[in-house]
């Protein structure tokens, strides 16, 4: 067990803060909830603190919760590939470029680290080149989320990881908006981190609303499990 992994044996409170600017539309979001890495479970509620969110909530899910991949459930035989927990408590910087097919792109930079007992994800997001009447600024996405696989590989040069995946957002007319994600994670501290073999995270996300909440918001329930590396031969013959 890595030193960082010990911090995730129980339920951990999570705070998410985001500052966004998409095509000049500024907004801020605050999220609170908890994570339980034993089950790879995240429960979070996000509120736009600046009125109405100028982009659809589903386009921010990866920035929020795929940002705290330290809550992913890594099975026993894969624990040595869990970069995310091993970087804690000092944390990691997570940078992404998200290309929305036939539309604009988001660039994000986040610092994910422990502050006391709370796991904090602070994010800055800049979006450019979006069409004013496109799927994103035109709010044409359905309020739901598909399951995805998130592919992880070691980046030995930077003592971190590279992550690639493609999100499929459902559009109201029945079609799909693709969003290509290119991600890089580097540790904030200078302690040792686990550099993984290639594997993937299997994610399932459910979006809902709080019937008693008047503000523009999103309630998120997510389960994330690491997979893609089989038991070694020594495991099989135990």
């Amino acid at each position: 067990m890595s030193k960082g992994e010990e911090l995730f044996t129980g339920v951990v409170p999570i705070l998410v803060e985001l500052d966004g600017d998409v095509n000049g539309h500024k907004f801020s979001v605050s999220g609170e909830g908890e994570g339980d890495a034993t089950y790879g479970k995240l429960t979070l509620k996000f509120i736009c603190t600046t009125g109405k969110l100028p982009v659809p909530w589903p386009t921010l899910v990866t920035t929020f919760s795929y940002g705290v991949q330290c809550f992913s459930r890594y099975p026993d035989h894969m624990k040595q590939h869990d970069f995310f927990k091993s970087a804690m408590p000092e944390g990691y910087v997570q940078e992404r470029t998200i290309f929305f097919k036939d539309d604009g792109n988001y660039k994000t930079r986040a610092e994910v680290k422990f502050e006391g007992d709370t796991l904090v994800n602070r994010i800055e997001l800049k979006g450019i080149d979006f069409k004013e009447d496109g799927n994103i600024l035109g709010h044409k996405l359905e309020y739901n989320y598909n399951s995805h696989n998130v592919y992880i590989m070691a980046d030995k040069q930077k003592n971190g990881i590279k992550v690639n995946f493609k999100i499929r957002h459902n559009i109201e007319d029945g079609s799909v908006q693709l969003a290509d994600h290119y991600q890089q994670n580097t540790p904030i501290g200078d302690g040792p981190v686990l550099l993984p073999d290639n594997h993937y995270l299997s994610t399932q996300s459910a979006l809902s609303k709080d019937p008693n909440e008047k503000r523009d918001h999103m309630v998120l329930l997510e389960f994330v499990t690491a997979a893609g590396i089989t038991h070694g031969m020594d495991e099989l013959y135990k």
């Epitope: 500024k26 801020s28 603190t49 600046t50 009125g51 904090v120 008047k214």
Partner: antibody, heavy 117, light 106 residues
Framework: QVQLVESGGGLVQPGGSLRLSCAAS????????MHWVRQAPGKGLEWVSG????????YYADSVKGRFTISRDNSKNTLYLQMNSLRAEDTAVYYC??????????WGQGTLVTVSS | ELTQPPSVSVAPGQTARISCSGD??????VYWYQQKPGQAPVLVIY???ERPSGIPERFSGSNSGNTATLTISGTQAEDEADYYC???????????FGGGTKLTVL
């Protein structure tokens, strides 16, 4: 306990500048958005400016846009308001306030800014 | 824009009601602040009808349609103050205040 203490107010001539500070204590400053609200003598409350917890997004009332700049130093637990090209109508008590999601939950005691020749 | 009556008078022990109106105000949360002379405002109601700790139970709030109301039951002399309603806006005027109501306890 949670405390906000403003400083930097005073008498300034029209067209002059002033920098207000707000020292925060008793809470984790970096987790809260912060705002400035003013109150002209005998008048109501007027929102002036706000800044997000991270500090990269700032917001201004039309009446001060281009003249005032809000900023924060999370390492010093301090909020600032740089006021340039001051006008007589900027005369007011300026309150520093903590923003909890979509409302102010804590106010400082205020600092008086008087713009007069 | 939020509209409040400039003044409301009430006898001690009676119920004071201060209104705050605005377009579709019931679809947003309303907050109420009390301000005594020479002092900073104090939050007395948040989220339409929630009371912060330390605020007496006689303070309550409601909000529906175009009008929010602050109700002070069994008004006391110490409740004499200016009261401001507030809400949030989507056009990056992040806080909108009503003009304020001076409550006089006769």
């Amino acid at each position: 306990q949670v405390q906000l203490v403003e400083s930097g107010g005073g008498l300034v001539q029209p067209g002059g500048s002033l920098r207000l500070s707000c020292a925060a204590s008793g809470f984790t400053f970096s987790r809260y958005g912060m705002h400035w609200v003013r109150q002209a003598p005998g008048k109501g409350l007027e929102w002036v400016s706000g800044i997000s917890s991270i500090g990269s997004n700032t917001y201004y009332a039309d009446s001060v846009k281009g003249r005032f700049t809000i900023s924060r130093d999370n390492s010093k637990n301090t909020l600032y308001l740089q006021m340039n090209s001051l006008r007589a109508e900027d005369t007011a008590v300026y309150y520093c306030a903590r923003w909890y999601k979509t409302y102010i939950d804590v106010w400082g005691q205020g600092t008086l800014v008087t713009v007069s020749s | 824009e939020l509209t409040q009556p400039p003044s409301v008078s009430v006898a001690p022990g009676q119920t004071a009601r201060i209104s705050c109106s605005g377009d579709n105000l019931g679809k947003k949360y309303v907050y109420w602040y009390q301000q005594k002379p020479g002092q900073a405002p104090v939050l007395v109601i948040y989220g339409d009808d929630e009371r912060p700790s330390g605020i007496p139970e006689r303070f309550s709030g409601s909000n529906s349609g175009n009008t929010a109301t602050l109700t002070i039951s069994g008004t006391q002399a110490e409740d004499e103050a200016d009261y401001y309603c507030a809400s949030y806006d989507s056009s990056h005027i992040l806080i909108v205040f009503g003009g304020g109501t001076k409550l006089t306890v006769l």
